[in-house]
Interface confidence: low
């Protein structure tokens, strides 16, 4: 037989706290134990679960745990079953709730001298005791004009008056604990002698010189006073109007009328109601003068056919907010279709060429109207008027390549030469019509040129080859003055190019023929052995059939090239002594001597007292100092050539003679004796 060693018993429990219903059984065979609540099996949850054969409650719940619990033990082999005694909880709880109006049915029905009943929706078990508060101050039962019914949880105000106005709250406590109202009730019972608002003035916006009306009404018993003030506290009455409110009228019903409104009338108007008791009520309204600013300019717009584009119209600042609409050709645009207005935007869907033109954005309010035009161009792909042609351009002259196209808007033209963009410079210029000008055609300008004409809608291009018609010219032009060394072999070259290979010949300027030792070999004048008679003026003539001939004049000078007769030597001089650097050159024409000291030419006119250059070319430096040390270069030059030679100058301290050395001992290095 199954025997219960411990049976569950009824007990007190606290809402939300732990509890345990015990159950222990003894049986000859294995049994399983389960629990019933009001006859239905209890399923385990995190809150309520079997603990061995007992039932454990992590947090008692007054709703889910009310009823009768029973422990059942069953032998699954024999089918024997035993049930414990019934057990239940006496759950103690308290739960907060709001303070609500019980009587009358709505706040709107609360009038002075009526009965008002408030209910405190705090509940619990055992039944709690209640305490009421007004504005945080406890109300005790039996005080004047109110009764507290703990049984019904009610507070009755009989009769209710302005002195009962305030914030009502309640608290309750029981053996379980304490709770206060979750939401409080504000009772507002107006004193009939207090001013109350019936009609409040509203802000108004009016155009200049129009009229404005403010309405204002208060009620009270006895009737309240009403006063209007302008923002600087100036009272407005029909008897005394401030200078800037001459056209103001206050009506018997409290309304204020302002006629022919000017900017100085704009501002805040205050309507003040004063009852027999209580504070004044101040109502405010602002009078705004309507205004509208100018609209910003639109940039012209270029769109492509077939695309969808939008143009936004920014409304001007204004009061009231200006309304905005778009027009085209004097007709207001619809709010749907292919070309339509959406909000402040002009929308052009699937643009056609016919959509081009002037569209106008309008903005208007009480203050007036503003408008702004936007010019819309529908771009087209360029078409050819004249393509660039393969051209022959003359060297040295300006050359032109056409690229004439038409489109909307005016197309932009760029040129390429050998696939490289031509940037305008001193040689290249692109005219407004697209034509390319090459200012001075050169041989290497003979190549491929390509022009591209574009608009936002697309581009076209074409190319042409330029052939340069080379002019007849010397390449290079012979030097007009040349020297030949006497008694030596000499050559004077002359070459030229042209559209056809030119023939080149030399002749003497006086027309006399060349001597036999002088030959003209394919333009090169060759002197086997130069004589004095070979000096003179010669002319190189280049000619071909189509271009005629050109001439270059050359003056040949026969010279004995420069040689040095005396060259300066490496020289060491004692400080304070005189240095002599000798230099003598010969040649024909007679060479001139110049000296360069320490990387600068020594100007004979600016040498100073210490330096002197002799007629024969030698350089003398008196009273030498260490800073005179360095390399000195002798430069000999005439109209035919220049030669130079250099030597170092060292300036040293004079040594002090030692005891062992006699007065005749030689110096340790070669010195100039002066």
């Amino acid at each position: 037989a199954i025997v219960f060693i411990k049976q569950p018993s009824s007990q007190d429990a606290l809402q939300g706290r732990r509890a345990l219903l015990r159950c222990e059984v003894e049986a000859p065979g294995p049994v399983h134990v389960y629990w019933l609540l009001d006859g239905a099996p209890v399923q385990d949850t995190e809150r309520r679960f079997a603990q061995g054969s007992s039932l454990s409650f992590a947090a008692v719940d007054r709703l889910q745990d009310s009823g009768t619990f029973q422990c059942v033990a069953r032998d699954d082999v024999t089918g024997e079953e035993a049930r414990s005694a019934n057990a239940s909880f006496n759950i103690k709880w308290i739960e907060a709730g709001p303070v609500v109006l019980k009587h009358p049915a709505s706040e709107a029905e609360i009038q002075p001298q009526t009965q008002v009943t408030l209910r405190c929706h705090i509940d619990g078990h055992p039944r709690p005791t209640y305490q009421w508060f007004r504005d945080g101050t406890p109300l005790s039962d039996g005080q004047s004009n109110h009764t507290v019914s703990s049984k019904e949880r009610n507070l009755t105000l009989r009769p209710a008056g302005p002195e009962h106005s305030g914030l009502y709250s309640c608290c309750a406590h029981s053996a379980f604990g304490q709770a206060c109202s979750s939401q409080n009730f504000t009772l507002s019972i107006a004193d009939e002698s207090f001013a109350r608002v019936v009609l409040a003035p509203q802000d108004v916006v009016v155009a200049r010189y129009e009229e404005a009306m403010f309405h204002c009404q208060f009620s009270a018993q006895p009737p309240p006073s009403l006063q209007w003030l302008f923002e600087d506290e100036t009272p407005i009455t029909n008897r005394s109007r401030p200078p800037h409110l001459r056209r103001a009228t206050v009506f018997a019903n409290g309304s204020l009328l302002l006629t022919q409104v000017r900017p100085r009338n704009a501002g805040i108007y205050r309507c003040i109601g004063q009852g027999q008791r209580g504070p004044p009520i101040i109502l405010e309204a602002t009078l705004h003068l309507a205004e509208i600013e100018d609209m910003p300019l639109f940039e012209p717009r270029v769109f492509t056919a077939g695309s969808e584009e939008r143009v936004t119209c920014l409304p001007p600042k204004g009061l009231p907010e200006p309304s905005v609409w778009w027009e085209h050709a004097g007709v207001r645009l619809p709010t749907h279709g292919r070309v339509y207005q959406k909000g402040h935007e002009l929308v052009l869907a699937n643009i056609a060429e016919s959509d081009a033109g002037v569209y106008t954005c309008h903005a208007a309010n009480l203050a007036g109207q503003r408008r702004q035009d936007v010019n819309i161009t529908v771009a087209t792909v360029p078409s050819w008027l004249k393509k660039p042609q393969d051209s022959q351009l003359e060297e040295g002259k300006p050359g032109y390549l056409d690229c004439l196209t038409q489109a909307t808007p005016k197309p932009t033209v760029v040129w390429y030469r050998n696939q490289m963009l031509i940037s305008e410079d001193s040689r290249f210029e692109v005219f407004k019509n697209g034509t390319l000008r090459i200012n001075s055609v050169e041989v290497y300008d003979g190549t491929w040129y390509r022009c591209m004409s574009s608009t936002p809608a697309g581009s076209i291009e074409a190319q042409a080859r330029v052939q340069v018609l080379e002019k007849l010219k010397f390449t290079p032009p012979p030097q007009p003055q040349q020297c030949m060394e006497f008694d030596k072999e000499a050559t004077v070259p002359c070459s030229a190019t042209g559209r056809e290979k030119p023939t080149i010949k030399w002749e003497r300027a006086d027309g006399s023929s060349l001597p036999e030792w002088v030959t003209d070999n394919a333009g090169t004048l060759h002197f086997a052995r130069v004589t004095r008679d070979d000096a003179g003026n010669y002319t190189c003539i280049a000619s071909n059939g189509p271009q005629g001939q050109i001439r270059a004049h050359v003056q040949l000078t026969v010279a004995v090239f420069i040689t040095f007769k005396v060259e300066p030597e490496r020289t060491t001089v004692y400080q304070g002594h005189t240095a002599l650097l000798q230099c003598e050159a010969q040649g024909d024409p007679k060479p001139l001597i110049q000296w360069k000291g320490k990387d600068r030419i020594l100007d004979p006119t600016k040498l100073g007292p210490r330096m002197h250059i002799f007629q024969n070319g030698s350089l003398v430096i008196h009273d030498v100092a260490p800073e005179d040390s360095g390399r000195y270069t002798c430069i000999a030059g005439n109209s035919c050539n220049i030669k130079h030679t250099e030597a170092p100058l060292y300036v040293v301290d004079k040594p002090v003679p030692e005891e062992s050395e006699g007065p005749g001992s030689p110096p340790p290095y070669k010195m100039i004796q002066t």
Epitope: V197, A200, E231, G267, I268, R270, P279, I281, I282, L283, E284, T286
Partner: nanobody
Framework: QVQLQESGGGLVQPGGSLTLACAAS????????MRWVRQAPGKGLEGVSS????????YYADFAKGRFTISRDNAKNTLYLQLNSLKTEDTAMYYC?????????????????VGQGTQVTVSS
């Protein structure tokens, strides 16, 4: 809800001084301009002085200039009005009023911007 409680009024002889205080609650005091207004017996309401939210701007009616000083302590949510050189014509109920967040000169008042007031009586 907005609550304003004036204090500091009383009976004073001509030439005397008083300091009125206004304790504010139920709104962000430091964000609003504040103002003193008064109502003499049998007369309309008139502005006395106003002060910006930060206390850096003040305005006075002509009769108050040089005699009255408005100030505020945002840490204590309190508005003050120092009344000096009082005259018999300064006798009135003095109210404190909540302005708006803008300039104190043109503060937009709510419908019932004032407390219950404090009575100042100047009499010999």
């Amino acid at each position: 809800q907005v609550q304003l409680q004036e204090s500091g009024g009383g009976l004073v002889q001509p030439g005397g001084s008083l300091t009125l205080a206004c304790a504010a609650s139920g709104f962000a005091f430091s964000s609003y301009a504040m103002r003193w207004v008064r109502q003499a017996p049998g007369k309309g309401l008139e502005g006395v002085s106003s002060i910006s939210a930060g206390g850096d701007e003040t305005y006075y009616a002509d009769f108050a200039k040089g005699r009255f000083t408005i100030s505020r302590d945002n840490a204590k949510n309190t508005l003050y009005l120092q009344l000096n050189s009082l005259k018999t014509e300064d006798t009135a109920m003095y109210y404190c009023a909540k302005g708006d967040r803008n300039s104190p000169r043109y503060s937009s008042w709510p419908i019932t911007p004032v407390g219950q007031g404090t009575q100042v009586t100047v009499s010999s």
